[in-house]
Every structure is written in structure tokens, then in C-alpha cells.
């Protein structure tokens, strides 16, 4: 479906040696930065979750077709504070609407090398990938 | 180690063997209900993003040792309705706390068998995971 | 080397509440999770719940669900728990074990590696 | 929930003996098993993780077998040390369940 040619790439390859463990986040393709439009920041009665929020967001495609899940979906806050449960618009400098990240299991294909160090298929090393998922409204962090 | 002999069989095996793909969600263990307490339906000052959130939320744990990854969380609204940007505390009706879902994609270790039908180590299935992600506050839907 | 010391022992009243602390050394403390386990006087063990420290994931037994509240402060690497409305049955000594992950990636193991000294809670009126 | 149930309760031997105690899990649990020691103190420790690889510094007197829902735990040599409570648990499935506990004696 994918076309890797085959995952593992002969009997007897320890499943190790298929899913190698790295700790260390792979940032995703563009930073984060907040991307505030006036022009959208409200909350809308109807429509998806991120559009009817307070702290509304849209998603940013980010895909890789070596990397299993390919495509990944950053958020992107459209207001730096939460928008007014009453009006839907005005926007209320006592919230602030900040992303919420997640480290996310992802897997990328990688060659690999028979006992001679011939190519011999891909393998799937698993990695933390960091991923924005919503943005959220919260009070402001008072600093002790 | 965890005696799993190969994960793919033999050599050329299709990688869509190893990683079949579903698009059937497969269920949370546990309903992703609300799960309100008033002690704790609150918005802190400090703390981390999920306490601060005006529509906070607890994790809970769902462990499968044969998924990759093996720990996921689901968010539990600890409130029916946002806490008052003013407050901290006070339910303001006019919002209500949303979860958020992700049809995540997970990996479940499976038998492989080869072409005779012997067992032949173990392959990974892909498949699409519905998880809570977050609470949300957001504004109420307004039928048409 | 990994330690975990708790606090003293609590005597407490029926209806009452208990807090139980574990102090974590020797290790990364948001790197494992903490179970909490329980033993009643002359029975065996009985597991209540855990806490993952770095994102204050839980998973609690059914049977103490509404009644548990499994927290930590990272800032001190201490994790608590904390039994409401106390029975006379829930006296019982109360253990603290963090959880190993062992073998390759990427299916872990999962073991008490080290646990507490106890903590006796005894409710009585 | 998954039942452990722990045999037997208790057992009395002599220093030397090689002791066996099982444990039947109330379905497959896949070798998701674990072994801990209670010394009379309260002191508890871990034994054998995963049926049967030895946790760190543990004599390789203790080992462990099994598959499917049927486990045992085996000192092949008693030694006076040994004196304590033996607890199975699983880790197949939350919660996690411990079988009732085999009490040890010293002839």
C-alpha cells in the first residue's frame, strides 16, 4: 500500500533491530509560532470543536511519507487570549488561549543492513514526535 | 526477549502484510465519560496546562502491552461547564467543558503466518485508536 | 541508590481522610510510575492504583474510585495518596512501589521494583 | 478483573529443601507474571519479573516457569533467609491483581 518493499528484511531479524527506541523528540517541520487572525478569532456557535472553542485553533498538514502516521496535524491558536463566553468575539485579557503538546509515538523507515552490510529492506524505528493537538484557555500562571 | 522470533517472517515479505490498515476505530477500554468532581472542578493558577485549562481535565491511564505505544491517555472533564475566568472556581453555564477526540494510530503485535500457515514470529497490525485527547471550553452548539 | 520513605503512621476516625506521602530518591522521578498498594492486617496485597508522575496519568481500581486521589509534586519528587471517608476496613498498612520498565523496546516489562516501608493507617472511633 | 489464585496458603520445610509454590491466574495473562518476597518485617521485594527472569541481586536460587494461566515458583535450596511471604501478580491486564500469598516456614 505504502510500497516499502518490505519491513523486515529477513527471517530471524530481531524485532529490536525493527523498532529501535530513540528518546529524543524529533521537532516537527515548522515551529509552533501562534498565528493569531483577527478575522477568525471567534468562537462560533456551530461547527467543529476547534472553531466553537474559546481559544479557537485550525490545523497545519505535516506530512512525511517516510514516517508512519504520513500525515500529522499541528494546531495553531488564532488568539492569544480566550474569546468572551458571552459575546463570541471580544476577547478576555484574564484568559489565555495556549497549545497543548503532546510527545506522539511515530515511526520512520529507515534501510536496513544485512550481517555483510548489504541493503536488505526497511525497518521502522520508533521516535517522539512533538505535536500541538488544540489550544486551550486557561487562567494565567501566577508566579509564586 | 520477549520471545517474539522475527517480527516479519521472511525476506519480501509485503510491508502491507506486516502493517494491515484498518480504518475501523478500535473503542476505548472504558467509555470516555464525564467524570465530574466538584472538589477538583476548578482552574488552578499554577500547575500544569490540564489543571490551569478553565475546563480542566484528569488523565487516565489505558495500558495494552501488545499495542504500540503500549501506555495511552484519556482526558476525563472534571467539570459539565467552564470555571469562571474571574474566579478560578464558579461554573459559568454560558460554556461548556468538550472532550476533544483523536482517532489515533496505534500498532497491535499479531501472529504472523507464513505460506504454509506455520506460525512465523509476529507482525504488526495498523489500526486507528479513538482517544480523548483534551477538555474544551466551548461555546454551545445553536441548532438551526 | 532508589529509596522510597513515606510518612508515619495515622490514626484516623471513621468519615475522616488520609494522606499518605512517598519521598523518591536515587532516580528520575518523572521517569517512573508509582503504584500504590495496600495490606490489611493478616491478608495479602491489594493494588489501589498508580500515578504517572510526569503528566499525573492515573488508573485507579474500581473498587476505590471516587474515594482515591493519587497525586505528586514534581518539585520534591514526592507522590501521595489520599483515602476519603475512611471505613474501619480500610485499616491496613499502605505501601508505595514504583514501577520498572524492563527488556528491549518497544514492548516493555512492567514490575515493583522498589518499594516503601509502609505506612500503618488505622481507623477507629 | 483477573483472579490469581495462589497455592498453597502456607508450607513448612527444611533448610536444603526445594520449595515449589504455583499460581493459576483466572485466564491467559501470557507469561505477564511477577514474584515478590514479604519478610516478616513488612520489607517487600522484588523477585522474578516476566515468569522468570531474575530481578538484580536476586540469588539464582529462586526461579520461575509457566505459560498460559499456570505459573510456578521454585527455591531449589531453602536457606533460613527464605523465611517470608511469597505474592504472584499479574501485570496482563489493570488492575493488577497479587494472588493471596504463600507463608513460608522453617521446620
Known amino acids: 500500500y505504502s510500497h516499502w518493499p518490505s519491513c523486515c528484511p529477513s527471517k530471524g531479524y530481531p524485532s529490536e533491530e525493527l523498532l529501535r527506541w530513540s528518546t529524543v523528540p524529533v521537532p516537527p517541520l515548522k515551529p509552533a509560532s501562534l498565528d493569531f487572525h483577527s478575522v477568525s478569532c471567534r468562537a462560533s456557535e456551530d461547527g467543529p470543536l476547534n472553531s466553537r472553542a474559546i481559544s479557537p485553533w485550525r490545523y497545519e498538514l505535516d506530512r512525511d511519507l517516510n514516517r508512519l502516521p504520513q500525515d500529522l496535524y499541528h494546531a495553531r491558536c488564532l488568539c492569544p487570549h480566550c474569546v468572551s463566553l458571552q459575546t463570541g468575539s471580544h476577547m478576555d485579557p484574564r484568559g489565555n488561549s495556549e497549545l497543548l503538546y503532546h510527545n506522539q509515538t511515530v515511526f520512520y523507515r529507515r534501510p536496513c543492513h544485512g550481517k555483510k552490510g548489504n541493503h536488505k529492506g526497511y525497518c521502522l524505528e520508533r521516535r517522539l514526535y512533538r505535536v500541538s493537538l488544540a489550544c486551550v484557555c486557561v487562567r494565567p500562571r501566577v508566579m509564586g | 526477549y520477549s520471545h517474539w522470533p522475527s517480527c516479519c517472517p521472511s525476506k519480501g515479505y509485503p510491508s502491507e502484510e506486516l502493517l494491515r490498515w484498518s480504518t475501523v476505530p478500535v473503542p476505548p477500554l472504558k467509555p470516555a465519560s464525564l467524570d465530574f468532581h466538584s472538589v477538583s472542578c476548578r482552574a488552578s493558577e499554577d500547575g500544569p496546562l490540564n489543571s490551569r485549562a478553565i475546563s480542566p481535565w484528569r488523565y487516565e491511564l489505558d495500558r495494552d502491552l501488545n499495542r504500540l505505544p503500549q501506555d495511552l491517555y484519556h482526558a476525563r472533564c472534571l467539570c459539565p461547564h467552564c470555571v469562571s475566568l474571574q474566579t478560578g472556581s464558579h461554573m459559568d453555564p454560558r460554556g461548556n467543558s468538550e472532550l476533544l477526540y483523536h482517532n489515533q494510530t496505534v500498532f497491535y503485535r499479531r501472529p504472523c503466518h507464513g505460506k504454509k500457515g506455520n506460525h512465523k514470529g509476529y507482525c504488526l497490525e495498523r489500526r486507528l485508536y479513538r482517544v480523548s485527547l483534551a477538555c474544551v471550553c466551548v461555546r454551545p452548539r445553536v441548532m438551526g | 541508590q532508589v529509596q522510597l520513605v513515606q510518612s508515619g503512621a495515622e490514626v484516623k476516625k471513621p468519615g475522616a481522610s488520609v494522606k499518605v506521602s512517598c519521598k523518591a530518591s536515587?532516580?528520575?522521578?518523572?521517569?517512573?510510575?508509582m503504584n500504590w498498594v495496600r495490606q490489611a492486617p493478616g491478608q495479602g496485597l491489594e493494588w489501589m492504583g498508580l500515578?504517572?508522575?510526569?503528566?499525573?496519568?492515573?488508573s485507579y481500581k474500581q473498587k476505590f474510585q471516587g474515594r482515591v486521589t493519587m497525586t505528586v509534586d514534581k518539585s520534591i519528587s514526592t507522590a501521595y495518596m489520599e483515602l476519603s471517608r475512611l471505613r474501619s476496613d480500610d485499616t491496613a498498612v499502605y505501601y508505595c512501589?514504583?514501577?520498572?520498565?524492563?527488556?528491549?523496546?518497544?514492548?516493555?516489562?512492567?514490575?515493583?521494583?522498589?518499594w516503601g516501608q509502609g505506612t500503618l493507617v488505622t481507623v477507629s472511633s | 478483573d483477573i483472579q490469581m489464585t495462589q497455592s498453597p496458603s502456607s508450607l513448612s520445610a527444611s533448610v536444603g529443601d526445594r520449595v515449589t509454590i504455583t499460581c493459576q491466574a483466572s485466564?491467559?495473562?501470557?507469561?505477564?507474571l511477577n514474584w515478590y518476597q514479604q519478610k516478616p518485617d513488612g520489607t517487600i521485594k522484588l523477585l522474578i519479573y516476566?515468569?522468570?527472569t531474575l530481578h538484580t541481586g536476586v540469588p539464582s536460587r529462586f526461579s520461575g516457569s509457566g505459560s498460559g494461566t499456570d505459573y510456578t515458583f521454585t527455591i531449589s535450596s531453602l536457606q533460613p533467609e527464605d523465611i517470608a511471604t511469597y505474592y504472584c501478580?499479574?501485570?496482563?491486564?489493570?488492575?493488577?491483581?497479587f494472588g493471596q500469598g504463600t507463608k513460608l516456614e522453617i521446620k
Open positions: 485466564q491467559d495473562i501470557s507469561n505477564y
Open positions: 501478580q499479574q501485570y496482563s491486564k489493570l488492575p493488577y491483581t
Open positions: 516476566y515468569t522468570s
Open positions: 512501589a514504583r514501577e520498572g520498565y524492563y527488556g528491549p523496546s518497544p514492548f516493555h516489562h512492567y514490575a515493583m521494583d522498589y
Open positions: 500515578i504517572n508522575p510526569d503528566n499525573g496519568g492515573t
Open positions: 536515587g532516580y528520575s522521578f518523572t521517569g517512573y510510575t
